[in-house]
Interface confidence: medium
């Protein structure tokens, strides 16, 4: 009779993570009598996966009933496969011996490759806000995929970016891999509503790339522009001065009015109006009692935006003469863009 052969018909098996791997093995003879064992790897460091004779192997089930006397099918199924299960599996026939069974014949081995999906890409931006015209860096990370081959792309508002660097680790063989990419993005004043997207494509995703996003609203700071204007006289001795704070983001803003360098009023932006581009406008006004001043008045609108150093704009009220009586204010003469003569 021909000597027993152990046949593993599949050179390789490809399984998705989480699924069940079937490793096929048959023997050509019932003789010699003895159990089958499955190992991952060869040599002294090999790992026991299944022992027909003894042991507890909760993830392993046999395809056929190994207790039947004429059984020659020693195929096994390994459940809930992870990338760590990748490797070459050997079906090994042992001959019954005393006191220990003796290894008799091994199959040629089946290489188990595990396909694992990448995790959802996580995009993170800079820790501190930056202003338009500055270049900021975004990072994208995804982990746990196999095989190593992967594609990563960056987009800003749907337009593909080219200024980025990507690394896949580790460089050598591994059960699973990670990808790390850094993209550089130049901010513009219109970027409050913009998005940066990192897209990862992998064989396991089958045409459905994974995307991670970052909103530039969390990255950008658009500093305000200030304009101080004098409104027509509201009452005989009162002048209304407004400070227009335009096109700022984020909303966090505090405004202080100074009269000749002395704090007159401080307020926080509350009822702002939003522009189409996502920036905000706000207006504050100050009612100045001219008769209380003997000299010219320098009005300053000072704005502290998002914790940045204050910016300011000034306006001069020129007090040229004082009324002899309360009711003798008659007119306001415009002598320049920032100057008013009050009579």
């Amino acid at each position: 009779e021909e000597e027993l052969q152990v046949i593993q018909p599949d050179k390789s098996v490809l399984v998705a993570a989480g699924e069940t791997a079937t490793l096929r093995c048959t023997a050509t003879s019932l003789i010699p009598v003895g159990p089958i064992q499955w190992f991952r790897g060869a040599g002294p460091g090999r790992e026991l996966i299944y022992n027909q004779k003894e042991g507890h192997f909760p993830r392993v089930t046999t395809v056929s009933d190994l207790t039947k006397r004429n059984n020659m099918d020693f195929s096994i199924r390994i459940g809930n496969i992870t990338p760590a299960d990748a490797g070459t599996y050997y079906c090994v026939k042992f001959r019954k011996g005393s006191p220990d069974d003796v290894e008799f014949k091994s199959g040629a081995g089946t290489e188990l490759s595990v396909r694992a999906k990448p995790s959802a890409p996580v995009v993170s931006g800079p820790a501190a806000r930056a202003t338009p015209q500055h270049t900021v860096s975004f990072t994208c990370e995804s982990h746990g995929f196999s095989p190593r081959d992967i594609t990563l792309k960056w987009f800003k508002n749907g337009n593909e970016l080219s200024d980025f660097q990507t690394n896949v680790d580790p460089v050598g063989e591994s059960v699973s891999y990670s990808i790390h990419s850094t993209a550089k993005v130049v901010l513009t004043r219109e970027d409050v509503h913009s998005q940066v997207i990192c897209e990862v494509a992998h064989v396991t995703l089958q045409g459905d790339p994974l995307r991670g996003t970052a909103n530039l609203s969390e990255t950008i700071r658009v500093p305000p522009t200030l304009e101080v204007t004098q409104q027509p006289v509201r009452a005989e001795n009162q002048v209304n001065v407004t400070c227009q704070v335009r096109k700022f983001y984020p909303q966090r803003l505090q405004l202080t009015w100074l009269e000749n360098g002395n704090v007159s009023r401080t307020e926080t932006a509350s009822t702002v109006t939003e522009n189409k581009d996502g920036t905000y406008n706000w207006m504050s006004w100050l009612l100045v009692n001219v008769s209380a001043h003997r000299d010219d008045v320098k009005l300053t609108c000072q704005v502290e935006h998002d914790g940045q150093p204050a910016v300011s704009k000034s306006h001069d009220l020129k007090v040229s003469a004082h009324p002899k009586e309360q009711g003798s204010n008659t007119a306001a003469e415009n002598t320049g863009s920032n100057e008013r003569n009050i009579y």
């Epitope: 998705a16 081959d149 992998h202 995703l205 045409g207 459905d208």
Partner: nanobody
């Protein structure tokens, strides 16, 4: 290897409709991006439509846009091609194919697809 089987082809008059189906003998078609291709006599095989694994991404060749719709029912592990307003130039053998290796959905290159069915004949004639 995935074994694909197409059905639903036949003879139809211009302006008519047909619905092609593609199933997998091993019931694994829900795992793969899938495409429909066609080959007319004496012409090269061309991509018609393709659909990603989840069905959320689809692509069409320009000549069938607005007339053909690709869809999938992953519970039934089947991919469909609904063909409306058929023209004589749509006459061809239609093949279903699974893309087991690509990162992105592509219908243009049939070399990306590595598991094919035997094809079903679609003839548009009055």
């Amino acid at each position: 290897q995935v074994q694909l089987v197409e059905s639903g082809g036949g003879l139809v008059q211009p302006g008519g409709s047909l619905r092609l189906s593609c199933a997998d003998s091993e019931f694994r078609l829900d795992e793969y991006a899938t495409g429909w291709f066609r080959q007319a006599p004496g012409k090269e095989r061309e991509g018609v439509a393709c659909i990603s694994r989840s069905g959320s991404n689809t692509k069409y060749t320009d000549s069938v846009k607005g007339r053909f719709t690709i869809s999938r029912d992953n519970a039934k592990k089947t991919v469909y091609l609904q063909m409306n307003s058929l023209k004589p130039e749509d006459t061809a053998v239609y093949y279903c194919a699974a893309d087991l290796t690509s990162h992105y959905l592509s219908c243009s290159s049939y070399t990306d697809y590595n598991s094919w069915g035997q094809g079903t004949q679609v003839t548009v004639s009055s």
